[in-house]
Interface confidence: low
């Protein structure tokens, strides 16, 4: 347990950690080893993890072997009604396991995000709840109607709609970012959000950008050909300049735009990318902000509620504001 | 770089109310608090409250409660304090501070302070 | 919440000075320090214990341990000379009476 004798490590690689866990050199400097969390034993081995303000309270100073990881005044948590503290790590459902750091809460998908296409074996995918379980599903309807599965279906894919695995290692901090968060608004200008920790603190915190689905003026039904029930993404028929609080884009863009369907399915993004705009606005003020371009939408039954947990959750409270 | 600007001395009679402006430029206003503090002359450094614009929350020292009034204004990106039933002890320059509750609560831009004098 | 600190601190040009700020289980909260020169508003040194904020000289270290948190100053000044207050959280803001550092 303590540090006197010579540094030996398993031989295996550096353990991985589960998500939100740093990954920490011990408290010898010999190994790296998962941090300790909230309320968990801690020695000068296994130390707690510093990245949520955590230390190793040993209580009487005679007793230096083994100690309870405690947090320190970082700012608590408010979520669902419950005050978290820093360093706490809980599950708000069996979607998402969450840790309040310093008054953010992040919170990672423990459920399978993906976006499954339409393919030849499965035309009309679906995410369903099963009884017992709490991840939602994809399940396949019986086609209905034989003549939408034709060669334009022929490129199944099963994918992360979000990129690569969030998750990744630099210099002793789990760098973890959320998946950017459906569109405030189905048309229109919105806004999307993630949480990260992808900074050279390895602090929490929320990060923006606009968006646009499609927009509101457009009537997109008008124009789903004869026979079909969607349009995944009309095609562009002029460029645009992107309106914002009275500010105009001071460029034009060819942007693509999600279309619509008429049997219940919705369209959404599918791959994004993020790109800086600059606005102009009538006082002759410039301001940049990123915004999320479209690069494909999918037509899916798994259609966005108003279910964005990052949304409500951001806002931070600190123990005075109990009273 | 933000740039907190507070409004000019005052001087007042006790038992009356005094309210200091406090307006942020050049940074994100409501996603901080704005925390006040008081120095008495000769004296350190006491807390008297803040305000989280983006919730509209406040909260008080306990030896303030009742007596201050912090308030703030998003469009303007000013906030505001108020002290009332002032008393000769309340003498001192008034400083706001932005109060950057993501790390723990830093104090990192002050305004320029505001001095208050309670007299007959 | 009570945090005390010595009322004065006097340090030779080039020596290390340290201001102690003692609190009942202080290693147990994080300790912001503050520099307050005469007729100026005061300016954050270190955050978190031991963070130095931008800008701020490495001269300026800060440590915490057990009921006592130190800010030392290295290499002292003569536009060190300023007083210094250590400030904790504890349901509010709480600050030490302060420490005049003099440097002759």
């Known amino acids: 347990q303590n540090c006197s004798g010579p540094c030996r490590c398993p031989d295996e690689p550096a353990p991985r950690c589960p998500a939100g866990v740093s990954l920490v050199l011990d408290g010898c400097g010999c190994c790296r080893v998962c941090a300790k969390q909230l309320g968990e034993l801690c020695t000068e081995r296994d130390p707690c993890d510093p990245h949520k303000g955590l230390f190793c309270h040993f209580g009487s100073p005679a007793n230096r072997k083994i100690g309870v990881c405690t947090a320190k005044d970082g700012a608590p948590c408010i979520f669902g009604g419950t005050v978290y503290r820093s360093g706490e790590s809980f599950q708000s459902s069996c979607k998402y396991q969450c840790t309040c750091l310093d008054g953010a809460v992040g919170c990672m998908p423990l459920c399978s995000m993906d976006v499954r296409l339409p393919s030849p074996d499965c035309p009309f995918p679906r995410r369903v709840k099963l009884p017992g379980k709490c991840c939602e599903e994809w399940v396949c309807d019986e086609p209905k109607d034989q003549t939408v599965v034709g060669p334009a279906l022929a490129a199944y894919r099963l994918e992360d709609t979000f990129g690569p695995d969030p998750t990744m290692i630099r210099a002793n901090c789990l760098v973890q970012t959320t998946e950017w968060s459906a569109c405030s608004k189905t048309c229109g200008m919105g806004i999307s959000t993630r949480v990260t920790n992808d900074n050279a603190s390895c602090r929490l915190e929320k990060q923006s950008r606009l968006c646009m689905v499609r927009p509101c003026e457009a009537d997109l039904e008008e124009n789903i050909k004869k026979g079909k029930k969607c349009i995944r993404t009309p095609k562009i028929s002029k460029p645009i300049k992107f309106e914002l609080s009275g500010c105009t884009s001071m460029k034009t863009y060819r942007a693509k735009f999600c279309g619509v369907c008429t049997d219940g399915r919705c369209c959404t993004p599918h791959r994004t990318t993020t790109l800086p705009v600059e606005f102009k606005c009538p006082d002759g003020e410039v301001m940049k902000k990123n915004m999320m371009f479209i690069k494909t939408c999918a037509c899916h039954y798994n259609c966005p509620g108003d279910n964005d947990i990052f949304e409500s959750l951001y806002y931070r409270k600190m123990y005075g504001d109990m009273a | 770089q933000m740039q907190l600007v507070q409004s000019g001395a005052e001087v007042k009679k006790p038992g009356s109310s005094v309210k200091v402006s406090c307006k942020a430029s050049?940074?994100?206003?409501?996603?901080?608090?704005i925390s006040w503090v008081r120095q008495a002359p000769g004296q350190g450094l006491e807390w008297v409250g803040r305000i989280i614009p983006i919730l509209g929350i406040a909260n008080y020292a306990q030896e303030f409660q009742g007596r201050v009034t912090i308030t703030a204004d998003k469009s303007t990106s000013t906030a505001y304090m108020e002290l009332s039933s002032l008393r000769s002890e309340d003498t001192a320059v008034y400083y706001c501070?932005?109060?950057?509750?993501?790390?723990?609560?830093?104090?990192?831009?002050w305004g320029q302070g505001t001095l208050v004098t309670v007299s007959s | 919440y009570v945090l005390t600190q010595p009322s004065s601190v006097t340090v030779s040009p080039g020596q290390t000075a340290r201001i102690t700020c003692s609190g009942d289980l202080l290693a147990k909260k994080y300790v912001r320090w503050l520099q307050q020169k005469p007729g100026q508003a005061p300016v954050l040194l270190i955050y978190?214990?031991?963070e130095r904020l931008s800008g701020i000289p490495e001269r300026f270290s800060g440590s915490n341990s057990g009921n006592m948190a130190t800010l030392t100053i290295s290499r002292a000044q003569a536009g060190d000379e300023a007083d210094y207050y250590c400030q904790v959280w504890d349901s509010s803001w709480v600050f030490g009476g302060g420490t005049e550092l003099t440097v002759l």
């Open positions: 978190k214990d031991s």
């Open positions: 050049g940074g994100t206003f409501s996603s901080y608090a």
């Open positions: 501070a932005r109060d950057d509750i993501a790390v723990a609560g830093n104090f990192d831009y």
